[in-house]
């Protein structure tokens, strides 16, 4: 049906056949998230009606199928500037039972009224400033927060579970007050971090190795990333101890989010969520992930359980395969990985033993090959600064900060550039922080050391003299046609 | 039976391993000598590197030497303080006590007046008193944004010990002194069993003997270029851009025959100036093939590949491209900060409509 | 990326031991289910043995009793020891690697022949 028809039906108000039209179009544009251009009058028409409607009430009986018009309506940003007013956001919230002025609705709420509301509400703060300023303004977040909270005492449906966290995700990450408000006032941390736990259904101590649901995996990511929004500007200060707590708390819960796999394909998204959070926590948190008890079947090394640091490894090999999006998919699992190498020493010689074992293909450069080490190696070439920075400072530390290590393991052509960011091109600091670290030579390496070129660090011949056979005067010569290209570039 | 030796058997065995040992160490020692050559334009960011290399000498400076810097101590310190003075103008920074101007004036006054290698108690009070203003220290946090000696804050931070009649340069002093280099720098450092020599060639021409043991057996060429340099507009005794010379050159020392075999590595320096130049300035200025998009990432490559593909011995020689900018940081979180939008972002990009 | 290589295939009399073994290579990787299969031919794979990460086995009936499945997480390989064999083991065995975020792999296969 098309939008006028619709709107012509609204105007001459018989209910049941404006009822009819709208269930029309909405099975007609259920799958529509691109309009024409040639009706967008028509449609605007037909928003401010449906507005003029929302904000004097709709009647109960048909209250879902004008919210789902509205919500097809929210998807065209040409409709945006009807549906975001004072007004319409107020009334959306209301039947959403989130508004902050009402008293709670007495009777248990229609969920699929209260779902098309969230769905409406999700679709405004997505694509539009001006209800993203409102729903700010509107504290929707305080009573979403309470709502969040009451989840271990009441039932409510897997969707408006997932609605309710993805429109605290939109909130957070387009509004910092909102992030500020849900951080502090609203002990946000807390709160999360108590429906995650519900959401895995795991108590902190038990690790089981579990496959997460579906559902359950769509709503922890929306957790993830709503913690992730909140903490991220926040965890940079110091941690009381009371934080600390709560931060390490979290943390288990990660872990085992790292340990678990998700239902469908969704593992690595899962992950990538839960590893951006981890990036998050407090330094000095981070040791729980070095926690894990040890059982039958877990990787142990010196004493410590790696499966998460595996897992972490893993994880990292799997994202570095891919070419876009670089950055944001690499930075922060090696942020996490470097932390725990510098801070934990069996952590370091795990990961060195992984990703740095002892030097035995000795003729090919450190950066070709497609072992672990070759990838991060070519990483720290790489054009985006901070994606070489991170690589090379993983490297650099897994070397025990010692830049001769650096250097053995990476070639100085390869290390040049973090030297050269940290002041270290000439050595600074002969040894790194972590004396007690040893680093064993293969017989391969021993054999070939005197060959290999420090700079490409690989064995290589060395090469006939350029320059063999000339007398005196032709090197002089060629040495000044040299000098004089050198003038001029430092002119 | 047959199998057990003597012990003068034994004994020589030792020997000729012992031998073979040395002979190998000697060969090592050799081998793991790696010289860099230095090469880069007045303002590509060379400097930079060249800070932080961390000059070891062998047995230091004597006293007599660390003496004669007194004079290079001085001058570095008021030229600091005159460059920083001018900048406050340049970058319309006022002094936080207007008493301040007078003293600025008289600064210049005294300065010009100024002994060699004497330093007045009255000038010395002048440069202090200037120091310690708060609008000078708000110009001094800018300097990069105009030319400053890097060891000004050291030696202003120092006047007191420095102003005393019997003032003696320390090895630390004459280490932070800057003089217009001219001709080669040679500058030794050591990792462990690697023994450095790099040599930072100025273009002055000195003697030329010194110039052939430069060239000789060269490990790495280190080539500094500022990105940011791309569209700077030609002076008028100039045939062509500051890029495209600093490409004709690299062309010519990447296909030197004295560095057929030389790595080099390539420092694309000033890379922030370059992000925020890329946005207004497109990069058909300097390259008027160019068909990409004017976003850092593709137009940094771009410049790479120019670079990059000047070379014509890709199979043996390598290049070792870093772009880097000053602002670089030590840590890890800084750079876990710089992502935290872009996740943001992407996990917007990623939510779809309902 | 993900390579499995088996290897303890052999002729064997019956009521001998075999010890098969598969082991991955090609990165860092976390193996969810390891399993063992086997074909004859005209016939469709069938199940032998499977573990979890976690340890937990699960066998076919025909070897209850017989072969023990096991692994090493640290070198990512599985074992099938078989004990007491029998003509009709006689079969290609394939394992079979669930790997997180890669999905399934399969060996090449190693031929078993009990005789008698």
């Known amino acids: 049906m098309e939008p006028r028809a619709v709107a012509d039906a609204l105007e001459t108000g018989e209910e049941d056949a404006v009822t009819e039209a709208l269930r029309s179009f909405n099975r007609e544009h259920s799958q529509s998230f691109t309009f024409d251009d040639a009706q967008q009058e028509d449609r605007k028409r037909l928003a401010k009606l449906l507005v003029s409607v929302l904000e004097q009430g709709l009647s109960p009986k048909h209250r879902v199928t004008w919210l789902q018009t509205i919500r097809i309506l929210s998807r065209d940003r040409s409709c945006l500037d009807s549906f975001a007013s004072r007004q319409s956001l107020h009334a959306l919230a209301c039947y959403a039972d989130i508004a902050i002025s009402e008293e709670p609705i007495p009777q248990p709420p229609d969920m699929d009224v209260l779902l098309e509301s969230l769905k409406c509400l999700c679709n405004l703060v997505l694509s539009s400033p001006t209800a993203q300023m409102l729903a700010a303004e509107a504290r929707l977040v305080v009573r979403l927060a309470e709502r969040v909270g009451l989840y271990r005492k009441r039932s409510y449906p897997h969707e408006v579970q997932f609605f309710d966290l993805r429109l605290l995700f939109l909130l957070t990450a387009l509004r910092t007050d909102v992030r500020q408000q849900l951080f502090q006032e609203l002990h946000g941390v807390r709160l999360l971090t108590d429906a995650l736990e519900l959401t895995l259904g795991v108590a902190p101590k038990e690790n089981p190795l579990v496959i997460l649901p579906a559902q359950e995996t769509e709503r922890a990511m929306e957790i993830l990333k709503v913690l992730f929004n909140i903490t991220y500007d926040s965890v940079k200060r110091e941690v009381d101890e009371e934080d600390a707590a709560l931060y390490r708390y979290l943390g288990t819960l990660l872990r085992h989010c790292v340990m678990a796999d998700a239902a469908g394909d969704r593992t690595e998204e899962f992950h990538g969520h839960t590893v951006n959070l981890l990036g998050n926590l407090p330094l000095k948190c981070l040791d729980v992930l070095l926690a894990l008890e040890l059982h039958e079947g877990s990787l142990e090394f010196m004493g410590v359980n790696m499966d998460v640091i595996n897992a972490l490894l893993a994880f990292l090999e799997k994202r570095l395969h891919q070419t876009h999006r670089l950055k944001e998919c690499v930075a922060p699992v090696l942020s996490v990985l470097t932390e725990c190498a510098r801070m934990h020493r069996p952590a370091r010689k795990f990961l060195k033993a992984q990703v740095l074992p002892p030097l035995r293909d000795v003729r090919t450069r450190p950066e070709v090959g497609d072992l672990l080490r070759n990838k991060l190696v070519r990483l720290m070439t790489h054009l985006d600064t901070d994606v070489k920075r991170v690589a090379a400072e993983f490297l650099f530390v897994l070397c025990s900060e010692s830049v001769p290590r650096f250097i053995k393991y990476t070639g100085y052509g390869n290390a040049a550039g973090l030297l050269a960011a940290r002041g270290l091109m000439a050595g600074g600091r002969p040894e790194g922080q972590y004396s007690e670290d040893e680093d064993t030579d293969t017989e391969e390496y021993r054999e070939a050391k005197a060959s290999i070129n420090p700079v490409t660090g690989r064995v290589e011949e060395k090469p006939p003299n350029p320059m063999e056979g000339m007398t005196e005067e032709q090197k002089e010569h060629e040495a000044m046609k040299l000098v004089n290209m050198f003038d001029k570039l430092s002119r | 039976m047959g199998c057990t030796l003597s012990a003068e058997d034994k004994a020589a065995v030792e020997r000729s391993k012992m031998i073979d040992r040395n002979l190998r160490e000697d060969g090592e020692k050799a081998a793991r000598e790696v010289k860099l050559l230095l090469l880069g334009a007045g303002e590509s960011g060379k400097s930079t590197i060249v800070k932080q290399m961390k000059i070891i000498h062998e047995a230091g400076y004597s006293e007599e030497e660390c003496k004669q810097y007194k004079a290079v101590v001085y001058s570095n310190t008021i030229q600091s303080i005159i460059a920083i003075i001018r900048a406050m103008g340049r970058l319309k920074i006022d002094f936080g006590d207007a008493a301040r101007a007078d003293d600025a004036r008289q600064l210049f006054v005294l300065a010009g007046a100024a002994e060699e290698g004497f330093m007045t108690a009255e000038l010395a009070g002048v440069i202090k008193r200037l120091w310690k203003d708060s609008g000078v220290q708000a110009c001094f946090n800018r300097s990069r944004e105009y030319q400053l000696n890097d060891s000004a804050a050291y030696y202003l931070n120092d006047l007191d010990r420095i102003a005393q009649p019997n003032y003696i340069p320390t090895q630390q002093d004459v280490l932070r002194t800057r003089v217009k280099t001219t001709g080669i720098v040679e500058t030794h450092f050591t990792f462990k069993d690697l023994h450095f020599k790099m040599f930072d060639v100025g273009g002055q021409r000195s003697e030329r003997k010194k110039w052939i043991h430069c060239f000789e057996g060269v490990t790495a060429i280190i080539f500094c270029v500022a990105l940011s340099d791309y569209d700077l507009v030609l002076a008028e005794d100039e045939e062509m851009n500051r890029m495209h010379e600093s490409m004709k050159l690299f062309d010519s020392i990447c296909n030197n025959k004295w560095f057929t075999d030389t790595s080099i590595i390539l420092f694309l320096n000033k890379k922030d100036l370059f992000e925020e130049k890329i946005k207004k300035s497109p990069l058909t200025i300097c390259y008027p093939e160019y068909a990409g998009s004017n976003t850092y990432e593709e137009a940094a490559a771009y410049i790479q590949c120019q670079f990059e593909d000047l070379n014509k011995r890709k199979d043996t020689k390598e290049i070792y491209t870093h772009f880097t900018c000053a602002t670089d940081t030590k840590n890890v979180q800084f750079v876990f900060d710089a992502v935290t939008d872009v996740i943001i972002k992407n996990n917007l990009k990623d939510c779809g409509l309902f | 990326q993900v390579q499995l290589v088996e290897s303890g295939g052999d002729l064997v009399q019956a009521g001998g031991s075999l010890r098969l073994s598969c082991a991955a290579s090609?990165?860092?990787?976390?193996?969810?289910?390891m399993g063992w299969y086997r074909q004859t031919p005209g016939n469709q794979r069938e199940l032998v043995a499977e573990?979890?990460?976690?340890?937990?086995?699960n066998y076919a009936d025909s070897v209850k009793g017989r072969f023990t499945i096991s692994r090493d997480n640290a070198k990512n390989t599985v074992y099938l020891q078989m004990n007491r064999l029998k003509p009709e083991d006689t079969a290609v065995y394939y394992c079979?690697?669930?790997?997180?975020?890669?999905?399934?792999?399969w060996g090449q296969g190693t031929q078993v022949t009990v005789s008698s």
């Open positions: 079979n690697f669930n790997v997180r975020y890669y999905g399934e792999y």
């Open positions: 090609g990165g860092i990787f976390i193996i969810n289910n």
């Open positions: 573990i979890t990460r976690a340890g937990n086995s």
